[in-house]
């Protein structure tokens, strides 16, 4: 098997060619979040701008109700950045009192919902303890990777605390995917 | 409309095919920054290595005077990492004196200058409060996303404080773009 | 030369076309690390899951013994995230004793090993001082960029301290590459 490792693949002779310009693509940008009901122990999903400013969807990649809808099977690069901001975390206040503590945290999860599996699948997670000493703090979490998706799959971005998300600028918090 | 969501697109029959190897691409790496004049209230732009070591530009993607020049319209993935390093921020010193304070921060912005819009457009921003307690600190900010660009657009990376940028290694601070 | 900058490239007429679906691609996910011997002053390499869960390799991109093997020359996008977690760093303890100190740090390096160069090449580095005040801390470092690779090149991910890597979930720590 090892010797064959770099042998040429004849698969490409029969594989369909297609123009890059017609591949499903989306870049979504942050909007002010309206509080929505979400299940206990489940992170809320962000909703997004899909057509104004820098945001777009194209080539049958659609956005609806917090989800990006995957219109064709294939390998996709998926990415998101969420900028969080808040006041001094409890952590530093407790620390000042000399008590050890579990730090507060911020988390972003890119989740896939698929027909072929009953539970949502966490594709990517960025999680960070927040134990800041200044009076205000802010920081981004960035994620990006490639996944094999099926037509009909739905992607969403969940966060640990929607009230900490910086929704003020489209360049600070965003979500995108494109077929490779 | 919903029923059509996953209908096949016939657009690809007519779309032009092209070889991936001839698409505009660039990966630029950090160099020592020479102090340059920059507008008040505008973050200074970094300049870059474009041909030595890991750096390259190809297929008409050119680098000149801090800018990547976009040679053809299309959807590009754009990315940058800037590693910052500094001494203890004022923040922790002020904190020790018991005064609340606005934390110091580090910011990276990927900016587009286009002739179809009279002002620069901020495509991506990574911003982080810095309130470190150690004597020296260092940390990266990474950004990456997809944008629709026009022929003639110019891309640059701006930072909040050029003196905090770690220019010592080409793998720590970099900037790139490629046509999808 | 300047006038020709945006002239059409005739190169694409002769460049080979190929189907996107047959390009070498891999997404590897974290597994529990077995302690391995590594050279002094050299960061240990992580090993990875390559076929279970979200992980895959395809189109002659193979994974073996901590390395991704590049089966054909071209421009690749390479990415990794490593989530670290630990107990309070020494840094804050020393700080409490009033002594200045060099902070602890966490580092991820994506390294290329190539036949044509005797030394490994560091492609990407993310490095961060860790000087946390809470009793437990955790945070990700994300890296991603495009590089020109040669058939036979090998890629690996090195970390400053393998014992701090969060191996509990495939979405927290991962490594991937795909031919553009």
């Amino acid at each position: 098997l090892k010797g064959q490792e770099f042998a040429p693949s004849h698969q490409q002779v029969y594989a369909p060619l297609r123009a890059d310009g017609d591949k499903p693509r989306a870049h979504l940008t942050v909007v002010r979040q309206t509080p929505t009901q979400h299940f206990k122990n489940q992170f809320p999903a962000l909703h997004w701008e899909h057509e104004l400013g820098l945001a777009f969807t194209k080539n049958r990649m659609n956005y609806t109700n917090k989800f990006l809808l995957i219109p064709e099977s294939g390998d996709y690069f998926i990415y998101s950045q969420v900028t969080f901001r808040g006041m001094t975390s409890e952590c530093s206040e407790i620390r000042q009192a000399g008590r050890p503590n579990k730090p507060d945290s911020i988390t972003v999860v890119i989740t896939k919902v698929t027909d072929s599996y009953p539970e949502p699948t966490q594709l990517l997670m960025g999680t960070k303890s927040v134990c800041e000493v200044g009076s205000n703090w802010f920081q981004p979490i960035y994620l990006g990777a490639m996944f094999s998706l099926q037509e009909g799959d739905k992607l969403m971005v969940n966060v640990s605390d929607i009230s900490l998300v910086d929704y003020t600028k489209e360049d600070k918090t965003f979500f995108g995917a494109f077929l490779l | 409309l919903k029923g059509q969501e996953f209908a096949p697109s016939h657009q690809q029959v007519y779309a032009p095919l092209r070889a991936d190897g001839d698409k505009p691409r660039a990966h630029l790496t950090v160099v020592r920054q020479t102090p340059t004049q920059h507008f008040k209230n505008q973050f200074p732009a970094l300049h870059w290595e474009h041909e030595l070591g890991l750096a390259f530009t190809k297929n008409r993607m050119n680098y000149t005077n801090k800018f990547l020049l976009i040679p053809e319209s299309g959807d590009y993935f754009i990315y940058s990492q800037v590693t910052f390093r500094g001494m203890t921020s004022e923040c922790s010193e002020i904190r020790q004196a018991g005064r609340p304070n606005k934390p110091d921060s580090i910011t990276v912005v990927i900016t587009k200058v286009t002739d179809s819009y009279p002002e620069p457009t901020q495509l991506l921003m990574g911003t982080k409060s810095v309130c470190e307690v150690g004597s020296n600190w260092f940390q990266p900010i990474y950004l990456g996303a997809m944008f629709s660009l026009q022929e003639g657009d110019k891309l640059m990376v701006n930072v909040s404080d050029i003196s905090l940028v770690d220019y010592t290694k080409e793998d720590k601070t970099f900037f790139g773009a490629f046509l999808l | 030369l300047k006038g020709q900058e945006f002239a059409p490239s005739h190169q694409q007429v002769y460049a080979p076309l190929r189907a996107d679906g047959d390009k070498p691609r891999a997404h590897l996910t974290v597994v529990r690390q077995t302690p391995t011997q590594h050279f002094k002053n050299q960061f240990p390499a992580l090993h990875w899951e390559h076929e279970l869960g979200l992980a895959f390799t395809k189109n002659r991109m193979n994974y073996t013994n901590k390395f991704l093997l590049i089966p054909e020359s071209g421009d690749y996008f390479i990415y990794s995230q490593v989530t670290f977690r630990g107990m309070t760093s020494e840094c804050s303890e020393i700080r409490q004793a009033g002594r200045p100190n060099k902070p602890d740090s966490i580092t991820v390096v994506i390294t290329k090993v190539t036949d044509s160069y005797p030394e490994p090449t560091q492609l990407l580095m993310g490095t961060k001082s860790v000087c946390e005040v809470g009793s437990n801390w955790f945070q990700p470092i994300y890296l991603g960029a495009m590089f020109s690779l040669q058939e036979g090149d090998k890629l690996m991910v090195n970390v400053s301290d393998i014992s701090l890597v969060d191996y509990t979930k495939e979405d927290k720590t991962f490594f991937g590459a795909f031919l553009l």
Partner: antibody, heavy 116, light 106 residues
């Protein structure tokens, strides 16, 4: 201070050429795009084209394509606009302006008179 | 090319009144830009990206619109507002200006 200073008035005969200059100060012209706009007496504004000083890449209004040439000298932060085969209807005030930098800035204008 | 049609050509109003200037594009544009010009002076950027006031422009001015129809509004005219206003589009090549609206004192 950000400003654009244009060269002085010109009087030309039909068929001749004119080359106008626009010197920038207070900013790097390579960070922006430089445009030329003209205004005939008592008329509106007419965009002629633009140059990207960083690359030398130009875009012209098709109606001027064969007669106009825009160039740049980054060492002196100056852009030039040459208009050939002048005719009487080219009599106008010619303005340079920048875009891509905040704020949009215009020069004071150069009057070109074409008369036999 | 995209043709911009401004209306009215001339608008005669008194100080204190409200002014509404229109600019219609022959095809959809992303944004509209407005310039003010007074006799013997270069045009001055007035409103950029449809609704953003340029530096120093009083807040009695506002811009709105999308697609093909754009408006510049002055809520309460001051004597210094009487001038010619031009709209310009940046979406298509070539860039084009409207013919201008002359705002004069009644």
């Amino acid at each position: 201070q950000v400003q654009l200073v244009q060269s002085g008035a010109e009087v030309k005969k039909p068929g001749a050429s004119v080359k106008l200059s626009c010197k920038a100060s207070g900013f790097d012209i390579q960070d922006t795009y430089m445009h030329w706009v003209r205004q005939a007496p008592g008329q509106g504004l007419e965009w002629m084209g633009r140059i990207d000083p960083a690359s030398g890449h130009t875009k012209y209004d098709p109606k001027f394509q064969v007669r106009v040439t825009m160039t740049t000298d980054t060492s002196t932060s100056t852009v030039y606009m040459e208009l050939s085969s002048l005719r009487s209807e080219d009599t106008a005030v010619y303005y340079c302006s920048r875009s891509g930098g905040l704020p949009d800035v215009w020069g004071q204008g150069t009057t070109v008179t074409v008369s036999s | 090319e995209i043709v911009l049609t401004q209306s009215p050509g001339t608008l005669s109003l008194s100080p204190g009144e409200r002014a509404t200037l229109s600019c219609r594009a022959s095809s959809s544009v992303s944004y509209m830009y407005w310039y003010q010009q007074k006799p013997g002076q270069a045009p001055r950027p007035w409103i950029y990206a449809t609704s953003n006031l340029a530096s120093g422009v009083p807040d009695r001015f506002s811009g709105s619109g999308s697609g093909t129809d754009y408006t510049l509004t002055i809520s309460r005219l001051e004597p210094e507002d009487f001038a010619v206003y031009y709209c310009q589009q940046w979406s298509g090549n070539p860039r084009t200006f409207g013919g201008g609206t002359k705002l004069e004192i009644k």
